[in-house]
Interface confidence: low
């Protein structure tokens, strides 16, 4: 009977960590000589298994090749890794007496595709916080997957975003691949509670994509709106000033009261009010004894937010000498307001 080496599968796909069988059958046991499995072709081909009774980690024969009539030379590879990818050839040799064994026929080859899962996507953003209306880039990276075909999508609050660029490397054939994608997001003041999600779908994930998440709270700065107001006096000798910092993020806030440019009080906010959009409010009260101030005084509320330049709001209160009516009060618009002490 004519010898034919048959590898019925042109390719097999196996998940990393699983096992796979590479089938090889012969139509004849003649001529006498060994069967060997190789990965690759040519001088650099790698001997994988030779049915010589040797112990090879992770590889064993499927059938009992010591049986005289055995024609099945299939092997099982266990705990497959991406490095096992390649084309495997079942090769029949004719035994030499003095000279080396001679290769007489090879199977058509079975390509092993290792299905390796992508790593959990890692989303990175800008090193510095951005402000509303600023465009910032986020990058998503995942690596170690095979085969090469993969889908990556970006979402912000459920809406799909179009990436600036997505690349899968290397472009040629490899045991495993990496993907990198960049998306541009326009920040807005409502984004403190928002998330940017990178979603990766791959054959190995069984329709359950992996997600990487960037909380925009880590990448946005919303500067406060600062207002200074004067409350109705509680007594004839007391003025109540209020400095209100509204809708800011992150929490880092320092508030200083100045009288005519001199620091009067440092206020370290402790109990911030949180808004539903994730931003914060803070109100600082400054009680001033009017009897100590006969001249005009400029009160300044200075707010430093998240290491940014200070925001200042002035409030002028007229001294007693300017007042013709006890307790009368004038308020001026814009940042500067002028009031009577009593």
């Amino acid at each position: 009977k004519e010898l034919k080496v048959t590898q019925p599968e042109k390719s097999v796909s196996v998940a990393a960590g699983d096992s796979t069988v590479l089938n090889c059958t012969l139509t004849s046991l003649l001529p006498v000589g060994p069967i060997r499995w190789y990965r690759g072709v040519g001088p650099s081909r790698l001997l994988i298994y030779s049915f010589a009774g040797e112990y090879v980690p992770r590889i064993r024969n499927v059938s009992d090749t010591t049986k005289r009539n055995n024609m099945d030379f299939s092997i099982r590879i266990s705990n497959v890794t991406p490095a096992d990818a390649g084309i495997y050839y079942c090769v029949k040799f004719q035994k030499g007496s003095s000279e080396p064994d001679t290769e007489i026929q090879s199977g058509g080859g079975t390509e092993v595709y290792v299905l390796a899962k992508p790593s959990p996507p890692e989303v990175s953003g800008p090193a510095d916080r951005g402000i509303p209306d600023q465009k910032v880039n986020f990058t998503c990276k995942s690596h170690g997957f095979s085969p090469r075909n993969i889908t990556l999508k970006w979402f912000k609050d459920g809406q799909e975003l179009h990436p600036l660029e997505t690349t899968v490397n290397p472009s040629g054939k490899n045991v495993s691949y990496n993907i990198s994608s960049t998306v541009r997001v326009v920040l807005n003041s409502m984004d403190v509670n928002s998330k940017v999600i990178c979603e990766v779908a791959h054959i190995t994930l069984d329709r359950s994509p992996l997600r990487g998440i960037a909380n925009l709270s880590n990448f946005i700065r919303v500067s406060p709106t600062v207002k200074v107001t004067q409350q109705s006096p509680t007594s004839m000798n007391q003025v109540n000033l209020t400095c209100r910092a509204e809708r800011f993020y992150p929490e880092d806030l320092q508030l200083i009261w100045l009288e005519n440019g001199n620091v009067s009080r440092n206020d370290t906010p402790k109990n911030l009010t949180k808004n539903t959009d994730g931003t914060y409010n803070y109100t600082s009260l400054f009680l001033v004894n009017s009897s100590a101030h006969r001249e005009d005084v400029v009160f300044t509320c200075q707010v430093k937010h998240d290491q940014q330049p200070a925001i200042t709001r002035n409030h002028t209160v007229l001294g007693f000498a300017h007042s013709s009516d006890q307790g009368s009060m004038q308020t001026f618009p814009d940042n500067n307001a002028t009031h009577n002490w009593n």
Epitope: K10, S11, V12, S13, I87, E111, Y113, P147, N149, I150, T151, S171, G172, K173, A201, H202, I203, L205, D206, R207
Partner: antibody
Framework: QVQLQESGPGLVKPSQTLSLTCTVS??????????WSWIRQHPGKGLEWIGA???????YYNPSLKSRVTISVDTSKNQFSLKLSSVTAADTAVYYC???????????WGQGTTVTVSS | DIQMTQSPSSLSASVGDRVTITCQAS??????LNWYQQKPGKAPKLLIY???NIEDGVPSRFSGSGSGTDFTFTISSLQPEDIATYYC?????????FGGGTKVEIK
């Protein structure tokens, strides 16, 4: 033995969307290990690869057509589909679907369906 | 995109002749090349995959060789039923691209 059969309208008006379906028989589209591709051939011309889909979702398109092409798969019906929007007379061609192993070529083809774009 | 340049674009040969078609890739594609036969009014048929492997059921007079950028397809003894157009196709890089085709006729 896997067989493929294209179906869809033979005549499409300019600016409309061309829609074709490829039905797979003799095997499961979701068995894995294959690309399911669309190829077209303009009258008297060569072959042009449109794109391919893997059953689980990843899709590749020819960049020259990407803005107008959508390929999708319906594993429950064992079918995959092609949509080509904003067609012109230049999209008149025979459209083929094929099964393609990772490294074993497009070994199974549909018989092809002729699509004419004309008003 | 990888450009596949096939030559000649057409040829005429006698029954029994040896016919050779070449395909040149614009970049190294290793052995990621297939050859197809297309008869008039029919779908293409895979003949050779991975540059040199003959598809099951394909007559042994068809063969392929080459690697890198230069590939050859050979019909060792042309038969009347071989009248067709032959295409090479690379799949090393997306998008997959085909050669322009070689039309083979009988003298």
């Amino acid at each position: 033995q896997v067989q493929l059969q294209e179906s869809g309208p033979g005549l499409v008006k300019p600016s409309q969307t061309l829609s074709l379906t490829c039905t797979v028989s003799g095997g499961s589209i979701s068995s894995g290990g294959y690309y399911w591709s669309w190829i077209r051939q303009h009258p008297g011309k060569g072959l042009e690869w449109i794109g391919a889909i893997y059953y689980s979702g990843p899709i590749y398109y020819n960049p020259s057509l990407k803005s107008r092409v959508t390929i999708s798969v319906d594993t429950s019906k064992n079918q995959f589909s092609l949509k080509l929007s904003s067609v012109t007379a230049a999209d008149t061609a025979v459209y083929y679907c094929s099964k393609e192993g990772y490294h074993s070529g497009m070994d199974v083809w549909g018989q092809g369906t002729t699509v004419t774009v004309s008003s | 995109d990888i450009q596949m340049t096939q030559s000649p674009s057409s040829l005429s040969a006698s029954v029994g002749d040896r016919v050779t078609i070449t395909c040149q890739a614009s970049d190294d594609i290793s052995d990621y090349l297939n050859w197809y036969q297309q008869k008039p009014g029919k779908a293409p048929k895979l003949l050779i995959y991975d540059a040199s492997n003959i598809e099951d059921g394909v007559p042994s007079r068809f063969s392929g060789s080459g690697s890198g950028t230069d590939f050859t397809f050979t019909i060792s003894s042309l038969q009347p039923e071989d009248i067709a157009t032959y295409y090479c196709q690379q799949f090393a890089y997306l998008p997959w691209t085909f050669g322009g085709g070689t039309k083979v006729e009988i003298k």
